[in-house]
Amino acid sequence: AGVFELQIHSFGPGPGPGAPRSPCSARLPCRLFFRVCLKPGLSEEAAESPCALGAALSARGPVYTEQPGAPAPDLPLPDGLLQVPFRDAWPGTFSFIIETWREELGDQIGGPAWSLLARVAGRRRLAAGGPWARDIQRAGAWELRFSYRARCEPPAVGTACTRLCRPRSAPSRCGPGLRPCAPLEDECEAPLVCRAGCSPEHGFCEQPGECRCLEGWTGPLCTVPVSTSSCLSPRGPSSATTGCLVPGPGPCDGNPCANGGSCSETPRSFECTCPRGFYGLRCEVSGVTCADGPCFNGGLCVGGADPDSAYICHCPPGFQGSNCEKRVDRCSLQPCRNGGLCLDLGHALRCRCRAGFAGPRCEHDLDDCAGRACANGGTCVEGGGAHRCSCALGFGGRDCRERADPCAARPCAHGGRCYAHFSGLVCACAPGYMGARCEFPVHPDGASALPAAPPGLRPGDPQRYL
């Protein structure tokens, strides 16, 4: 026994053009609610067929009134989970129908009016006790996002909720041949012996000595496939008692069953008996395995050898995603240091280093001054991947080999004359100017347009500046 749980995340317009009109209006406010119907196995039954695994109805959502002219947003949802209890084993594969209903809250006579907004259906494989599975389904222009899981109710455990757990009789360990009941480690797996010969694939038991059959199987040991045809002859005369088909073209003509399935007629239609690994109304569905080549870009597919087991893709370097379909942009991590240029070559990363740097990631700063000398007493300065010489007074050029003419740049302003000197240069200023570069005019009244004097100096004292 256990519970199937459904969490609706959003219901609103799907992507793409043709957004649906809001289901509610200012004149007719409304609210949503959801119905879920579960059926065991992967049979593609009509929506009206019974929900053999169970059904549930959600609470009503908050009242919603459309804003005039606004596109339909995601609509307000009811709180809480939809829970469908199941009494027997969880079948592992199941079909679901989720319906979105609108309850109009206008002033209808006889209470609110209900109308079906959208219906989605699907078939899934799901082990009880696993994590939430996320899903997106579209119905017309609407999109429904939801998650679901199946969980066992104690004392049941396992992927089908068929193993039972009982409290330990002794505090330290379980009895002989019995295992601790993960995840309830303080409990022990109950000894559960089904009827001798009960099919391990198609039968199970909840009480010792019984043999209960999964859907599609019958007989005392669940070894006989269920046959839905009640006719002795496939073209027998129509009869109210047998429910047999009337003569005429048979539904199996032309064999509608794909993938080697064999067709048998039923009172209403036909039924396909599918080969191992295939299912669906026409055997057109099969599990995705490694034979499908689901791993891309050289990804290694592991598991999934038989139709009932999942596959996992192990991706090569540079690729990610459940199917290795996404290329990792390894350069986005900026692996190249010191301004190096990153190149993703697919099989490897390369860094193209700026001058003065080296290494796989440009991490080594080369000694720019190694083996380089600056002449005439200049000193070498490293920087930015190139060496530079700081030259002694009177010398210049890349390596300080050129004798500098300090007067070449005409440093003396206002017509001052420049003289090269062992300590640099000296400016002889023209009348009316003063300063190291003749930059300050001397005013006729004896004051000069000097900058504010440093502490201890009086403005207008030209001798101090000479």
Epitope: L42, T93, V120, G122, R123, R124, R125, L126, I136, Q137, R138, Y279, G280, E284, V285, S286, G287, V288, D292, P294, F296, N297, A310, G321, S322, N323, C324, E325, K326
Partner: nanobody, 117 residues
């Protein structure tokens, strides 16, 4: 529920070309794989080529360089361009669709490709 409709099979001489198409309809989700498998008489069904909706592809070694898979995501159609066909390419070609992170996938009814000498 997904329905797959194949077309483009037929009889062709060795060295010739054919183009198969497969259109998917129904609940075709954004992230999926569409592709082609084939089954020759008395042999196992094998993957020929497939393509993720994101653009990644896989090819069987025996068809690399001769067959090209492509798809139109907007229309949910996958194509298989088969050039330089060989006798051993004779088989029933099945379209295959499956959604990412889904337990199951769907098959088309198959289209016969016969390569004669």
């Amino acid at each position: 529920q997904v329905q797959l409709q194949e077309s483009g099979g037929g009889l062709v001489q060795a060295g010739g070309s054919l183009r198969l198409s497969c259109a998917a309809s129904g609940s075709t989700f954004t992230s999926n794989v569409m592709g082609w498998h084939r089954q020759a008489p008395g042999k196992q069904r094998e993957l020929v080529a497939n393509m993720h909706s994101g653009g990644s592809t896989n090819y069987a070694d025996s068809v690399k360089g001769r067959f090209t898979i492509s798809r139109d995501n907007a229309k949910n159609i996958v194509y298989l361009q088969m050039n330089n066909l060989k006798i051993e390419d004779t088989a029933v070609y099945y379209c295959r669709w499956y959604g990412i992170q889904r337990a199951e996938g769907y098959w088309g009814q198959g289209t016969q490709v016969t390569v004669s000498s």
